[in-house]
């Protein structure tokens, strides 16, 4: 019998999406192209509920994790990766005090139990994010014997 | 009890700038959260968002009208703004505002005020 | 055309139960934004109906509700009533527009 998995191993399912929390760290552009060579994108948030399961997973993991936002385009106004403003009730999501732009802190990142904004060429955990497999269509991801992780192979 | 009027005129010429002042009660634009949008309904069509500004001076605009809009708040004086130029016969319509709170849903609005573009 | 596509009529007798969709696509309901529900009494203006999915706000009877799915919503009236009859119109946002976006707006009929 084939089991339907509609993510890849060592990937996370939540509300439809497979989310993919690195073992690694890169800066955020780095980040941004290790999610596209896997066929994903660095996490862009879109309701409250994705918003507390991710920050769970970070806050969880002890570990410092970009996110796809940043105000590298023009200083002070916030955007996704996938070009969408950040929009007015994700700003409470902010830590106390952030974002702050101490010292061009352009990227923002999960940090504790909100975000926080930080200098882009950090290294940082990251996570992505795809569209989950649907299980009724013939592309569907049967458990996979090859995981996909957009990690380096170890040095 | 929160309350949104609006005011503005009910007659525009074509290519006159037409401005729509929203005056509002039971809360403040001050407050973390808070929005107030402009939305209009053109008569017996469908509602369409236009422009939105929140608490912490964020604006945000309707793609296609982007060039023509200008949203500002008066904090002391718990009114928005909307500032529309060129306008047009198509832009008549009942235009309302409303506040949004968090999760962005449209939680209180204003009775509308009908603006007729003619010459 | 709107973004969010909802049949223009839908209609009932009272007592009855009906329901009305809302069909967005990925860059909107189906990218898990939030869906809320407006009636617009004949004259009035929109009234927050459901928020959120599937929220009602106080004062509104829980024969209403509603549900999201995918790419679409819908929302549900049951045991018909003849000031049903309205306008309802979903929202969501959409990340393509970067704006909030409205579907076309569902008359309702009760019948009788």
């Known amino acids: 019998e084939r089991l339907c998995h509609p993510c890849p191993w060592e990937w996370t399912f939540f509300q439809g999406n497979c989310y993919f929390m690195s073992n690694s760290q890169r800066n955020w552009h780095d980040s941004i192209t290790a999610c596209k060579e896997v066929g994903a994108q660095l996490v862009v948030i879109k309701s409250a509920e994705e918003q507390n399961f991710l920050q769970l997973q970070s806050s969880r993991s002890n570990r410092f994790t970009w996110m796809g936002l940043s105000d590298l385009n023009q200083e002070g106004t916030w955007q996704w990766v996938d070009g969408s403003p950040l929009l007015p009730s994700f700003k409470q999501y902010w830590n106390r005090g952030e974002p702050n732009n101490v010292g061009e802190e352009d990227c923002a990142e999960f940090s504790g139990n909100g975000w926080n904004d930080d200098k882009c060429n950090l290294a940082k955990f990251w996570i992505c994010k795809k569209s989950a497999a649907s299980c009724s269509r013939d592309e569907e991801q049967f458990l996979s014997p090859a995981p996909a992780t957009p990690n380096p192979p170890p040095a | 009890q929160v309350t949104l009027r609006e005011s503005g005129p009910a007659l525009v010429k074509p290519t006159q700038t037409l401005t729509l002042t929203c005056t509002f009660s039971?809360?403040?634009?001050?407050?973390?959260?808070?929005?107030v949008s402009w939305i209009r309904q053109p008569p017996g069509k469908a509602l369409e968002w236009l422009a939105l500004i929140d608490w912490d001076d964020d604006k945000y605009y309707s793609t296609s009208l982007k060039t023509r809009l200008t949203i500002s708040k008066d904090t002391s004086k718990n009114q928005v703004v909307l500032t529309m130029t060129n306008m047009d016969p198509v832009d008549t319509a009942t235009y309302y505002c409303a506040r949004m709170a968090l999760r962005h849903a449209f939680d209180a609005w204003g009775q509308g005020t009908m603006v007729t573009v003619s010459s | 055309q709107s973004v969010l596509t909802q049949p223009p009529s839908v209609s009932g007798a009272p007592g009855q139960r009906v329901t009305i969709s809302c069909t967005g696509s990925?860059?909107?309901?189906?990218?898990?934004?939030?869906v809320h529900w407006y009636q617009q009494l004949p004259g009035t203006a929109p009234k927050l109906l459901i928020y959120v999915n599937s929220n009602r706000p106080s004062g509104v009877p829980d024969r209403f509700s509603g549900s999201k799915s995918g790419t679409s919503a819908s929302l549900a009236i049951t045991g018909l009533q003849a000031e049903d009859e309205a306008d309802y119109y979903c929202?969501?946002?959409?990340?393509?527009?970067?704006?909030?976006?409205f579907g076309g707006g569902t008359k309702l009929t009760v019948l009788g």
């Open positions: 990925s860059s909107n309901i189906g990218a898990g934004y939030d």
């Open positions: 929202q969501s946002y959409d990340s393509s527009l970067s704006g909030w976006v």
């Open positions: 039971g809360f403040s634009l001050s407050t973390s959260g808070m929005s």
